[in-house]
Each structure stands twice: as structure tokens, then as C-alpha cells.
Interface confidence: low
């Protein structure tokens, strides 16, 4: 088992993740581990020399870069917020701010926009991953209601009047809850006509 640096006539290295082909000397050299960079290139007699990334910089993968990448903050102008800080081995982890979704994606989210409101009688369909797409509003299922325009309000079950010792004065709809009344109270005048047999 050869240890870098070793000669390679076919321009490939045994461990593609941790080694790379150096064409000038036709040898395989070690890559630098995450969190480091190449401080001295390899030669036929000496392997790659690595150094730790300076503060506020990182390299995420085994690499043969001569510099570390600069840490970038999550840009609130683009609707992003930080969920994990930058380390020498990992860039700053960002996500869309609450109430926003990712509108532009280039390897990672670059721009978030505000979620659309769902109108009364509907709710946002639950997604596997928060912030991945705009709201898709779906009607409240039977026996449920939602009475606001909101990106996040959920449909709630209609009140069951009998559970409160009351009777139903008006049935619930997708946009309004059931109206309950004391069984001893008369119906309001505008509704009394509907009860004629």
C-alpha cells in the first residue's frame, strides 16, 4: 500500500476523496482535511503540508485549495437567518426567516420571499421541509374552519355545542365556527323563521 506521494502513470489515485493527482510530477498527493488548506504543495519527496483555516474562514471538504473560503453571514436582506455559525469545517448554515420560503436556489437558498396568505376556509398544506416552497392553500376538511387571512393559521375543529351543555344555533362552515346557544334561550329573530316546521 503506497503512501503519498507516490507515482501514478494512469493519472488516477487510489483514494479519490483524500488524494489528488498532481500532473507536474505525475504523482498522487494527499488532500488536506476539512478545516485546513494547502500551505506547501507536494513534491516527489514530500507530501502536501496542510494548515488550519484562520478565524472566519473554512473549507468543508478534503481539498487541495491554497486558501480557505471566507465565512459569509446569512443575509437578512434576502430573508435569511442563521441556524448554525461558521466553523473551520463548515460554512454558516442559513434558513428562511419565519413566514418566508426559499424563492431562489443555487446549491443553497439565496433568496427568501414571504409566504402567501391562505384565505378564510383554507390552510397551508403541510410540507416535509419548512421554508422549501410557497404556501399551497387547501380547503378545510369537513367539520373544520379557519376564519383569517394568514400564511400559518390552521383549520380548527368546529365546536361541539353538546360538549358544553349547549345546543347548536347555527352550523359551522369552512370559514366560521358553530354558533352555540343556551337551550333555554329563544333563537334570535333573524333565525327563528328557519325553524318553522
Amino acid at each position: 500500500q503506497a503512501v503519498p506521494p507516490y507515482a501514478s502513470e494512469n493519472q488516477t489515485c487510489r483514494d479519490q476523496e483524500k488524494e489528488y493527482y498532481e500532473p507536474q510530477h505525475r504523482i498522487c498527493c494527499s488532500r488536506c482535511p476539512p478545516g485546513t488548506y494547502v500551505s506547501a504543495k507536494c513534491s516527489r519527496i514530500r507530501d502536501t503540508v496542510c494548515a488550519t483555516c484562520a478565524e472566519n474562514s473554512y473549507n468543508e471538504h478534503w481539498n487541495y485549495l491554497t486558501i480557505c473560503q471566507l465565512c459569509r453571514p446569512c443575509d437578512p436582506v434576502m430573508g435569511l437567518e442563521e441556524i448554525a455559525p461558521c466553523t473551520s469545517k463548515r460554512k454558516t448554515q442559513c434558513r428562511c426567516q419565519p413566514g418566508m420560503f426559499c424563492a431562489a436556489w443555487a446549491l443553497e437558498c439565496t433568496h427568501c420571499e414571504l409566504l402567501s396568505d391562505c384565505p378564510p376556509g383554507t390552510e397551508a398544506e403541510l410540507k416535509d421541509e419548512v421554508g422549501k416552497g410557497n404556501n399551497h392553500c387547501v380547503p378545510c376538511k369537513a367539520g373544520h374552519f379557519q376564519n383569517t387571512s394568514s400564511p400559518s393559521a390552521r383549520c380548527q375543529p368546529h365546536t361541539r355545542c353538546e360538549n358544553q351543555g349547549l345546543v347548536e344555533a347555527a352550523p359551522g362552515t369552512a370559514q366560521s365556527d358553530t354558533t352555540c346557544k343556551n337551550p333555554l334561550e329563544p333563537l334570535p329573530p333573524e333565525m327563528s323563521g328557519t325553524m318553522l316546521m
Epitope: A103, A104, H111, E113, L114
Partner: antibody, heavy 119, light 112 residues
Framework: QVQLVQSGAEVKKPGSSVKVSCKAS????????WSWVRQAPGQGLEWMGR???????NYNPSLKERVTITADESTSTAYMELSSLRSEDTAVYYC?????????????WGQGTLVTVSS | DIVMTQSPLSLPVTPGEPASISCRSS???????????LDWYLQKPGQSPQLLIY???YRASGVPDRFSGSGSGTDFTLKISRVEAEDVGVYYC?????????FGPGTKVDIK
Amino acid sequence: QVQLVQSGAEVKKPGSSVKVSCKASGGTFSSYFWSWVRQAPGQGLEWMGRFYSGGSANYNPSLKERVTITADESTSTAYMELSSLRSEDTAVYYCARERRGYSGGFEIWGQGTLVTVSS
Amino acid sequence: DIVMTQSPLSLPVTPGEPASISCRSSQSLLHSNSYNYLDWYLQKPGQSPQLLIYLGSYRASGVPDRFSGSGSGTDFTLKISRVEAEDVGVYYCMQPLQTPFTFGPGTKVDIK
């Protein structure tokens, strides 16, 4: 139709603070960015900072230590407070609502509040 | 900070004639989402500014179609196809790509 109504003109002494209000009527307050822009007499426009109704704010570094932007969502009112006032802070201060889902695009403006700093 | 420049700073116009204002930014305003983050505003005498164009070329609601925005990257243009008397005022470009948002110095448009 949304309207932004700002508080009245103020005269302040150097070193003091001023707090300007901006009340939104006729539309939702939440889920928008609210910016403040100022204009010194006969000069151009300077962006001061912005507030997202979710609670985050960012400021112009030239004013960062002195400006605070807040909001009271229950009254649909945004506030801009500027401290350690100096004569060069004499300006008309505008609040503006940004286009929904877009950075910038100040689509609705308040009428402006003149703040005069004079000893 | 991104520095915005405009030219000309003063523009005398004739009603019915076209007019054009240039705006340059010190760095590209073209975002990876393919939109140019540039706005145009008009401040009429004694009034608050009003949004004319956003994202470089999108007319704001209620803005007459004689106003158009074009350009990409660092060079942008606002065109008025036929100037009307009500178009007088100071025109500002602004970049909302990065905070702090920055405005151009303004172009004063008045009738010859």
C-alpha cells in the same frame, strides 16, 4: 388602500432623542419590511434601516449606534428613534413599506416628519 | 457600501419629447436569482418619493407606461417616452441588494 400616517414635526435640542411614529391603516401590518429614509434640506435620500414585522431589524452602519427601529403590531405602528441628535440630523424622516416578498421597492410612503435639531 | 451614481444631475426637458436618465452602481446588482436589484423613484416638488420601477424593469402599479426601466449588472437607464408636465421632480435610483440600501444623488428634471 393602505396609508401611512406619520407623527407631527419636532424641534429638538442637540444631544437629545426623537421618536417618530408611522401608523398603517387600511391593510395588514405584519409580513412586510418597514424602512425609514431621511432627507436633509435640499439633499438626497438616505436609507436609515428596516424592520421586519417578525421582529428582526437591520440598520445603516453610519447610524447604527444611534438609531432604533421598532413596531407595535397591535396598533399597526412602526417607530424610529434617533438618539444623540446633532444639527446635521435636521431632515424630513419618511417611513416606507416595501413590496411584499421583495427586498426594496418602497411602494407606500408616509407623508414625512420634519425634525429640526437646533440649540 | 454600494455607491450609486446618476447622470445627468440636471435635465431640462420639452413636453412631448423623450428623456433618459442613467444610473451606475459600484458593483453588480444582478442577483443569482437573475433579477437586477434596482429601483427608480420620483419625488415631485413638496411630496414624498413614489416608486416607479422595481427589479430594474418592472413598473409599479399605477405607473404610466411611458416610464420604462432597462439595464443589467452595473448600468441602468430610466426612459420617459414622452415627457409630460407632471413628470417634473427629482428621480432617484436605489439599490436594495445589500444593506445599507443606497440611493443615487438624484436627477432634477424640469421643463425648459
